[in-house]
């Protein structure tokens, strides 16, 4: 009789593939900067407050923090500062900065977002003389998304780390995973309820091998779930302790081996760590 | 090079309009603040106002804010000030000045200044 | 509105002589390792040309005989040694709050 083995090294597997687009969303595609701004990717609806959290890697005695937009030409157009910026013109009041107690974390945000303010944010951190410079955070993209009339879904919103695009793919994949979960929990009961001849047969292949069928095995639920932006960030599952023979029958659930599009990866990739804006937007930030 | 040309200094007859352009060059327009201030014959400094080119945001000194407009031509890097309602005190050099966006700092580069004469 | 007062309103001295012009807020203009308050010379028939910035900091291009220093309400500005070339009315200028202002100015003429 061929071994099988249970699911739980595959939902082990799945649950450490989950930890990847986050991951890729926070490096390597973002390089280290002496200000981070984040979640790299926000979306709101429109009339919701936007909140994007810029930290300094340290507190030095003098600076002006400042937050940016970026202009369709690259150039940084300035919103709000901490320290007031008690002068500036035309400053439009919806654009907060707020210093957090801990000092080292700003929350940027704008009140009653619009949908015109969809865009490429940064902050900048300027350091006066003597020792004058400017130091930019990487760039984050915040989507403003028309006021829905439907009621919020009861699951729980992904962290804002997700694109728009990729909130309702994981909402839906987490619905269908628990209801996979569910599904296999009655296998178990009904297997339990209803012993098979399969006494005595230990299902616990090692960790290494392969899945069989023998001429022997239970049917197999095939889900092809395509590719899945798993955006869980909890503790690593533990591989499931060896077992002793049971009687229970298991459902396998195959993923097939599909390589991710590269289209996908282009949500974190295309939010790049900050360059300097191209020659012929003259300077931005810096002055000449 | 960095520069602030002005133009549109005149005589004009109380009660009169003027229009003065500040042609900035050698830096990128917009990340720079545009101020305007004047000084009367022997007199000090007194600042009427600013713009910010990004979004053509301005502010006023509370004598000047019913009188004065100020604007900006991204596509020309210039700024104006408009001044209605003028009179004999409004007779003074006019100068277009500049301040880091990034910073509550100094005005580093100022127009060579355009002199306004309001008299019948 | 912000006064700036400045003394002395006129000063002559003799060149390789030290000079300083006093500029007093009505309030303070300092905050966290800041104090938002600039100096500026203007010599005849010219526009103002900024000197310091930020109470102590030497614009670009301006000689290192010229110093700011002060925070709060009083700052000072010091031409170590004085030069046929620094007559003009110097100015000191707060950027705190709106309205923006200048102090009156003092004359600073060379013998």
């Known amino acids: 009789m061929g071994s099988r083995r249970g699911p739980w090294p595959l939902v082990w597997a799945v649950l450490q593939l989950g930890w990847w687009p986050g991951w890729l969303l926070d490096s390597p595609d973002r390089p280290w900067s002496p200000l981070t701004f984040s979640p790299a990717q926000l979306t709101v609806q429109e009339g919701e407050n936007a909140t994007f959290t810029c930290s300094l890697a340290d507190i030095p005695d003098s600076f002006v923090l400042n937050w940016y937009r970026l202009s369709p030409r690259n150039q940084t157009d300035k919103l709000a500062a901490f320290q007031e910026d008690r002068i500036e013109p035309g400053r439009d009041r919806r654009f907060r900065v707020t210093r957090l107690p801990n000092g080292r974390d700003f929350h940027m945000s704008i009140v009653a977002a619009r949908l015109n303010d969809s865009g490429i944010y940064l902050c900048g951190a300027i350091y006066l003389p003597p020792n004058t410079q400017i130091n930019e955070s990487p760039r984050a993209e915040l989507s403003v998304t028309e006021r829905t009339l439907e009621p919020p879904t009861q699951s729980p919103s992904p962290p804002p780390r997700l694109s728009g695009q990729l909130q309702g793919l994981v909402i839906g994949v987490t619905s269908v995973l628990v209801g996979v979960l569910l599904l296999l929990l009655l296998t178990w009961v009904l297997a339990a309820v209803f012993p098979r001849a399969t006494r005595g047969a230990c299902v616990c292949g090692s960790e290494d091998e392969p899945l069989k069928e023998g001429p022997d095995a239970a049917p197999v639920f095939t889900l092809d779930y395509g590719e899945l932006d798993f955006q869980w960030r909890e503790k690593t599952p533990e591989p499931p302790a060896p077992c002793a023979p049971e009687q229970t029958e298991y459902a396998t659930i195959v993923f097939p081996g599909r390589p991710a599009s590269p289209g996908r990866r282009a949500s974190a990739s295309s939010l790049q760590g900050a360059q300097p804006p191209s020659p012929e937007d003259g300077p931005g930030l810096w002055p000449p | 090079e960095v520069q602030l040309v002005q133009s549109g200094g005149d005589l004009v007859k109380p009660g009169g309009s003027v229009r003065l352009s500040c042609v900035a060059s050698g830096y990128t327009f917009t990340s720079y603040y545009l101020y305007w201030v004047r000084q009367a014959p022997g007199k000090g400094l007194q600042w009427i106002g600013g713009v910010n080119p990004s979004n053509g945001g301005t502010n006023f000194s509370e004598k000047f804010k019913s009188r004065a407009t100020l604007s900006v031509d991204k596509a020309k890097n210039t700024a104006y000030m408009q001044l209605n309602s003028l009179r004999a005190e409004d007779t003074a050099v006019y100068y277009c000045?500049?301040?880091?966006?990034?910073?509550?700092?100094?005005?580093?580069?100022w127009g060579q200044g355009t002199l306004l004469t309001v008299s019948s | 509105d912000i006064v700036l007062t400045q003394t002395p309103p006129s000063l002559s001295v003799s060149p390789g002589e030290p000079a300083s012009i006093s500029c007093r807020a009505s309030k303070s203009v300092s905050t966290s390792g800041f104090s938002y308050l600039h100096w500026y010379r203007q010599k005849p028939g010219q526009p103002p040309q900024l000197l310091i910035f930020l109470a102590s900091n030497l614009e670009s291009g301006v000689p290192d005989r010229f110093s700011g220093s002060g925070s709060g309400t009083d700052f000072t500005l010091r031409i170590s040694r004085v030069e046929a070339d620094d007559a003009g009315v110097y100015y000191c200028?707060?950027?705190?709050?709106?309205?923006?202002?200048f102090g009156q100015g003092t004359k600073v003429e060379i013998k």
């Open positions: 000045t500049r301040r880091d966006s990034n910073y509550d700092g100094g005005f580093d580069y």
């Open positions: 200028q707060h950027s705190w709050e709106l309205p923006l202002t």
